[in-house]
């Protein structure tokens, strides 16, 4: 694993445990939480950063309108079940034996239910939509320029292959990414989409997972993008499965 | 490691127009972004402009209309021109890295060069 | 622009004792959405060039010895040199980035 050898820190993830006993002395870091070794020459998924946080001591455009599928994460942190490979479980349930099935991002999908309840694959997040809102600016940031430096963003320091930025939209004071990544186009080695935005959507609210000064400094053309909301939605490849009565509450 | 280093004549005559040269090395021109800040003998940091790692520039308004920074990716090498200069733009002048999304702060500089106006 | 004003321009403190240097700028520098200010301080001593100390506003940079400390938010900051040391004696300057960048004025630190 690439963590810096000379002091022996794994620069894609602080909330890991490091130490200089892989082979031939190597760095080796190992997430909190579960204790998984990670790759920290990349994105650490989204399964054990979840699992590491609940372990932490606890501190002319037109926009697109998601899909009446589309789920948004209003359950919040638990503490997941993650599979050998660090992917979510498809089913998760908490300790009064509640029992639920989650996407790919581990978000819910389904009602909640008890221990019978069968879920029976890992339903892929294939298409997510982030919508930011920022603070005024003097004037509208440049669309291009916004355009560039976001998939710049997603590249360079996410790590995620420019084909799965579908696009960047933007209306004053509105912006919207859209990510995308079906399972077949999706490569061994390659990003995962949930976690790229994860790793985002920390960053955007100051919380970033990368060791080093801890902050996302965003600058379109030198001015800071200063993000006051965020909401994302996640499209999953089959459709989730909530009662009616939830769809009319 | 991350290294920098100013280089360029020492000597300008009024009128005429400074270049100075950042060499750098230990990171990617097209991943980081670099600083030019000068400072006059016994005076305080001004800063001059960036050259951003998207490539875009940003001047300090006093001096906007004089100035200009580009980069040479193949030459691993930023460049600052200063035109009309005075005696007032004698200074030492520094390159320093932009931490990219890290927070636009300084934790790289080169030593400096002197650079004297006079005729 | 935003302008940086240091106080006081020169300090002289005894070995040991707690120097305090201040830092206003002309608007807030407290990013909303993340809720850091983009202020930085720097350390540069005769010959050398600056040297980074804290970021945003209170995070001491990797290396640093703890007796240097930031505090402050929106417009008003303060850099401590809890117990002053021989080698700290050098100009201390504030830096915003909030809007491009500007330098405060520097303090010269000195030993009394």
């Known amino acids: 694993h690439t963590a810096a050898q000379d002091n022996c820190t794994c620069p894609t993830n602080k909330m890991t445990v490091c130490s200089p006993d892989g082979p031939g002395g190597r760095c080796q870091c190992r997430a909190l939480g579960s204790g998984m070794a990670v790759d920290c020459s990349t994105l650490t998924s989204k399964c054990l950063l979840l699992k590491a946080r609940m372990s932490a001591p606890k501190n002319a455009r037109t926009l697109v309108r998601p899909s009446e599928h589309a789920l948004v994460d209003n359950d919040g942190l638990y503490d997941p079940d993650c599979d050998p490979e660090g992917r979510f479980k498809a089913r998760q349930c908490n300790q009064t034996s509640v029992c639920w099935c989650v996407n790919s991002v581990g978000v819910r999908r389904t009602d909640k239910g008890d221990l019978s309840l069968r879920c029976d694959e890992l339903v892929r997040t294939h298409h997510i939509l982030i919508d930011l809102r920022h603070r005024p600016t003097a004037g509208a940031f440049n669309h291009s320029d916004l355009d560039a430096e976001l998939r710049r963003l997603f590249r360079e320091r996410y790590r995620l292959h420019p084909k799965f930025v579908a696009a960047v939209h933007y209306e004053q004071p509105t912006i919207q990414i859209e990510l995308r990544q079906n399972t077949s186009q999706k490569a061994a080695g390659d990003v995962d989409i949930g976690d790229a935005a994860y790793y985002f959507e920390r960053d955007i609210k100051g919380e970033s997972l990368f060791q080093g000064r801890g902050g996302l400094d965003l600058r379109v053309r030198g001015e800071p993008l200063q993000v006051e909301r965020t909401l994302i939605y996640y499209l999953d490849e089959i459709p989730p499965k909530f009662s009616m009565k939830r769809l009319t509450a | 490691q991350v290294q920098l280093q100013e280089s360029g004549p020492g000597l300008v005559k009024p009128s005429e127009t400074l270049s100075l040269t950042c060499t750098v090395s230990g990171f990617s021109l097209t991943s980081y972004g670099v600083n030019w800040i000068r400072q006059p003998p016994g005076k305080g940091l001004e800063w001059i402009g960036v050259m951003w790692a998207g490539g875009s520039t940003n001047y300090n308004s006093a001096l906007m209309s004089r100035v200009t920074i580009s980069k040479d990716t193949s030459k691993n090498q930023f460049s600052l021109k200063l035109s009309s200069v005075t005696a007032a733009d004698t200074a030492v002048y520094y390159c320093?890295?932009?931490?990219?999304?890290?927070?636009?702060?300084?934790?790289?500089w080169g030593q400096g060069t002197l650079v004297t106006v006079s005729s | 622009d935003i302008v940086m004003t240091q106080s006081p321009d020169s300090l002289a403190v005894s070995l040991g004792e707690r120097a305090t240097i201040n830092c206003k700028s002309s608007?807030?520098?407290?990013?909303?959405?993340?809720?850091?200010?983009?202020l930085a301080w720097y350390q540069q001593k005769p010959g050398q060039p600056p040297k980074l100390l804290i970021y945003?506003?209170?995070s001491r940079e990797s290396g640093v010895p703890d007796r240097f400390s930031g505090s402050g938010s929106g417009t008003d900051f303060t850099l401590t040199i809890s117990s002053l040391q021989a080698e700290d004696v050098a100009v201390y300057y504030c830096k915003q980035s909030y809007n491009l960048f500007t330098f405060g004025g520097g303090t010269k630190v000195e030993i009394k």
């Open positions: 608007q807030s520098l407290l990013n909303s959405g993340t809720r850091k200010n983009y």
């Open positions: 945003w506003a209170s």
């Open positions: 320093a890295r932009d931490e990219n999304w890290d927070g636009a702060w300084f934790a790289y």
